[in-house]
């Protein structure tokens, strides 16, 4: 009989469920923007805004100094009066809408959606290795902001992104607003604009450069501005908005927007539409072509990328990969698919298309009908000409316009659908060691940290737990200060280390071992930790070979029995080649000799189930007492594998040594040409894993085995005879005399 | 490239007024502030005032009150500064430069002589 | 108004030699300083700014530290173009004011 163990599935080695308690901030209301600093002296500060405040954090998430930003017009408001004499603009609630560093002074920006969406400068005083926010400075000029001009009118209370970048001896403000008919016309913020806050920081400089929705396209046309970041030589802006102006304004698609840094200009504004796609690898009847299509953009990050990952996107370790957690609409309701997708855009890759698509409007011969795009910003134009122009003229040029690139960047889910049911609404990545981990905030409060790879059909998680009992959503966007990154979900503020909270959720030494090294886990006899959580028998080099079952569970005291062993760390091998004297197992007293690996019954065992067999055959010693006993594998002196060796013991209960015993045997007579079915009674008659009834030292074949009734039929006789029968159980006679007659057909 | 330039020497009267104008280039004239410097023979440097381009405010070094006045053209990206009612201890070298933190951008320096 | 106290009022030191030139402030200023060089008959020449970020294509043996009230402008291994006169300036509010100054000599 061929008995073979139960899978265990990959997911029994790890418990999800494990409560973790990481630091946090009790903010006192909803978290509305978040920002951390870390200055040169190891003086570092976290700043955590809500309604009407703004609060300073130390490292160690407690609270240094408070800030009131709001209400608008309320004597108490400790920002407003910054700007002198009221009244400055209607009374209101502040709600943050910009919280960013200017890293060259250094310095905290924060901008709010009252007092026409204006901001205030809050110098930084490192005291020890907290910081504290000097008085604040409005930057606000009165006399110089008008509802049709206002350069000190930043933020919009639809939503405004913003870059801070130095050029030169300036700190440049690259601002992204989202707009509508109201909004536009209350102190014309602009779509998206470049704004040089002035050196005595009484506000921005005018006459600076912008692009705005175009007046008759504000009511339909809504542009929401999802992330921003400067690397290299640009600033680039992500949107999600309508993927025409002529059509369904709820047909929506997500674009990148790119910026020079390095020059204060808007000529060479460029957007390219990023295509990211959930394509399983067995295609549905009906499903689309190239895959289902995730065009919404939730939340992203760019980072640079560990050596794996970059080998799998054909690019260079290091490099800065935009990475996006798309869905299928505005609600991320549920689809065919899965409920989020991440892909993957590689910064550079990003560049040369966009580059390209310059090319192709500007350098002839330009294909007939190649339109410039962006017609909710600008005159419609045909390539090469400059928007609502109906040719270049000899002083223009056709690099100097914003241009909406002609081809789209086409990626697929890099986790291949895995994420299934899980609303993703937070992501930072960083690299450890040569590993490229995502952090993501989930709708349910969770934090999942998972290997960013492509080529695996499971997920490697270095953790996944709650926050904390709210199970509010986690918010967009995260911070990174030293080693930790900081969540928001509600009123809190967490702090969760880049390397996983811990590494209890791991419950087997063998996937402790396997853990990531930048995780610290080590086992402690009977759980994974860190070090410091249990410091006296905390390790990372062996682990012990773990039994969790075996086959058959009773044997004959005499005779022997192939016992099979389950479990896991066996081997550490694939092969599952044993180097000779390692491996001792013993039943009681008896030894177990291991036998060789029959090649014929390996078979390959996917990655999200696992389990180890070791057989060995049992030989009871002649002192060995029926009765029940342990089975013991001891494993010693193996070779190391890739993460540990395996060294120790393991020991299951629940073997029985038994002696089988014939009762009778009925009828005890037959026909010569054979084929009578013969019923042996007794007891323990199935002990071990072989026995065979022999008439007259012929096999008579088994049709039936239980504890206490074997079934055969008897083979033909040879002539008319009385012939012994005899039973063995495990190659060994069990005691008794008996015959059969064969007897004329 | 931004390049400021200034007018040349002057040789004035006690008593008399003198302008000086700096003119901009490379880069864009209303965006920044334009910012006058004395400096007199073996001293250090004196912040008189500056001027926003755009909007042409102005703001003073409370001993400059009275004696200089700052104007700027936008049509030709020109700042110009007058001194009134010269003496001696006007005499020194008066610089443009252009807002920043910390001026990157200075101009030749024009040179004002008050003699009788 | 702001004070600017620059000291030493003169140095002298060889090519080669490091030099530390120190500014204060009579109020804190964080880190709106800036460090020029003046050359004799030219125009100031910006160095630092932001009390530490060297202005572009000054040489790295220049260095800017400080915050709030005390500043300094350090020189590395000084070379013969190095000697001239330096000053420190705040920009943190108005009127925006100069040290006095500090002449560095060959000596």
């Known amino acids: 009989e061929d008995w073979q163990c139960p899978r265990t599935p990959y997911a029994a080695s790890r418990d999800f469920d494990v409560k973790y308690v990481v630091p946090s901030f009790s903010a006192g209301g909803l978290v509305q923007a978040m920002v951390t600093y870390e200055g040169d002296r190891n003086e570092s500060a976290v700043f955590v805004a809500i309604r009407n405040r703004l609060h300073v954090l130390g490292p160690d998430l407690k609270s240094v100094q408070s800030l009131a930003t709001g209400p608008a017009g309320d004597p108490g408001c400790q920002t407003c009066a910054a700007c002198g004499p009221g009244p400055h603009g209607p009374p209101g609630d502040t709600d943050t809408k910009v919280l960013v560093l200017d890293p060259a002074l250094p310095a905290l920006v924060s901008c709010g959606s009252s007092l026409q969406g204006r901001c205030f400068l809050h110098d930084l005083e490192p005291q020890g290795t907290a910081v504290h926010l000097a008085a604040p400075a409005c930057l606000f000029s009165a006399h110089h902001n008008r509802p049709d001009d206002c350069p000190d009118c930043v933020a919009s209370p639809l939503g405004t992104r913003v870059t801070v970048v130095e050029q030169g001896q300036a700190s440049y403000f690259y601002v992204a607003s989202s707009l509508d008919a109201a909004v536009a016309a209350s102190f014309s913020p602009r779509s998206v604009s470049i704004r040089r806050l002035k050196a005595d920081a009484s506000g921005f400089a005018p006459g600076f450069v912008a692009l705005s929705v175009l007046p008759k396209h504000l009511v339909s046309y809504s542009i929401e501005y999802v992330h921003s970041f400067h690397t290299g030589a640009f600033v680039y802006f992500l949107t999600v908005q309508p993927a025409s102006v002529t059509d369904d304004p709820s047909a929506l698609h997500t674009r990148l927007a790119r910026l020079s840094a390095t020059e204060p200009e808007l000529g060479d504004y460029r957007e390219l539409v990023l295509d990211c796609r959930f394509a399983p690898k067995r295609r549905r009847r009906g499903a689309p072509e190239g895959g289902q299509p995730y065009p919404v953009l939730r939340v992203a990050h760019s980072a640079p990328v560990g050596a794996q990952l970059a080998t799998e996107l054909s690019i260079a370790e290091g490099q800065e990969v935009l990475f996006g957690v798309f869905v299928t609409g505005k609600d991320g309701g549920p689809g065919v698919g899965p409920n989020s997708v991440v892909c993957a855009f590689p910064i550079d890759l990003l560049d040369t298309l966009i580059d390209e698509g310059v090319e192709r409007c500007c350098e002839s011969p330009v294909h007939p009908g190649l339109r410039r795009g962006l017609d909710f910003f600008q005159s419609p134009s045909f390539c090469p000409n400059p928007p609502g122009l109906e040719a270049l003229s000899p002083n223009t040029s056709c690099r100097h316009f914003p241009l909406l690139v002609s081809s789209s960047f086409s990626r697929v889910d890099l986790f291949n659908g895995l994420l299934g049911p899980v609303q993703v609404t937070a992501l930072y990545v960083t690299r450890l060691d040569n590993v490229t981990v995502a952090h993501m905030g989930t709708m349910d409060g969770r934090i999942l940290q998972v290997e960013l790879v492509r080529s695996l059909n499971y997920l490697l998680y270095v953790s996944n737990f709650s926050l904390g009992d709210s199970g509010q959503p986690v918010q967009r966007d995260v911070s990174r200060l030293g080693d930790h990154l900081l969540f928001a979900s509600g009123d809190q503020v967490f702090q969760v280390p880049i390397q996983g909270p811990g590494c209890r959720h791991f419950l087997t030494c063998g996937r402790c071992l396997r853990a990531w090294h930048f995780m610290g886990c080590g086992w402690c006899g009977n759980m994974c930790g860190q070090q410091k959580e249990c410091p006296g028998s905390w390790q990372q080099d062996h682990c012990p070979p773990k039994l969790t079952e075996f086959h058959p569970h009773s044997g004959p005291l005499r005779g022997s029995t192939r016992l099979t062993l389950c479990g896991s760390n066996f081997y550490l091998h694939p092969s599952g080649l044993v180097p000779e004297g390692t491996h001792q197992v013993t039943v009681g007293q008896s030894p177990c000799r291991p036998l060789p690996k029959d090649s014929s019954k390996l078979r390959p065992v996917p990655r999200k189930d696992f389990v180890e067999e070791f057989e060995c055959e049992l030989e009871p010693l002649g002192t060995q007492a029926v009765g029940p006993t342990n089975v013991s594998l001891t494993v010693t002196n193996m070779p190391p594998g890739k993460h540990f060796r395996v060294d120790g013991t393991s020991v299951l209960r629940g073997f029985s040594f038994m002696e089988p015993v014939l009762i009778a045997v009925q009828p005890l007579f037959g026909p010569r040409a054979g084929g009578t079915c013969l019923t042996l009674e007794g007891q323990s008659l199935s002990v071990g894993t072989s026995r065979a009834v022999l008439v007259n030292g012929t096999e008579c074949l088994l049709a039936r085995v239980s504890e206490g009734q074997l079934l055969c039929a008897t083979p033909p006789g040879a002539t008319v005879a009385s012939v012994p029968l005899s039973l063995q159980v495990g190659g060994a006679q069990v005691p008794g005399s008996w015959t059969f007659q064969y007897r004329e057909d | 490239e931004v390049q400021l330039q200034q007018s040349g020497p002057e040789l004035e009267k006690p008593g008399a007024s003198v302008m000086i104008s700096c003119k901009a280039s490379?880069?864009?004239?209303?965006?920044?502030?334009m910012n006058w410097v004395k400096q007199s023979t073996g001293k250090s440097l004196e912040w008189i005032g500056d001027i926003d381009p755009y909007y042409d405010g102005t703001r003073y070094n409370q001993k400059f009150k009275g004696k200089a006045t700052l104007t700027a053209d936008k049509s030709s990206s020109t700042a110009y500064m007058q001194l009134k009612s010269l003496t001696s201890e006007d005499s020194a070298v008066y610089y443009c430069?252009?807002?920043?933190?910390?001026?990157?951008?200075w101009g030749q320096g024009t040179l004002v002589t008050v003699s009788a | 108004d702001i004070q600017m106290t620059q000291s030493p009022a003169s140095l002298s030191a060889s090519v080669g030699e490091t030099v530390t030139i120190t500014c204060r402030a009579s109020?804190?200023?964080?880190?709106?300083l800036a460090w020029y060089q003046q050359k004799q008959g030219k125009s100031p020449q910006l160095l630092v700014y932001n009390a530490k970020t060297l202005a572009g294509g000054v040489p790295s043996r220049f260095s800017g530290s400080g915050s709030g009230t005390q500043f300094s402008l350090k020189i590395n291994s000084l070379q013969p173009e190095d000697f001239g006169s330096y000053y420190c300036?705040?920009?943190?509010?108005?009127?925006?004011?100069f040290g006095a100054g500090t002449k560095l000599e060959l000596k």
């Open positions: 109020e804190n200023i964080y880190s709106y």
């Open positions: 430069t252009r807002e920043g933190r910390g001026f990157a951008y």
């Open positions: 300036q705040h920009y943190y509010g108005t009127p925006l004011t």
């Open positions: 490379g880069y864009s004239f209303t965006g920044y502030n």
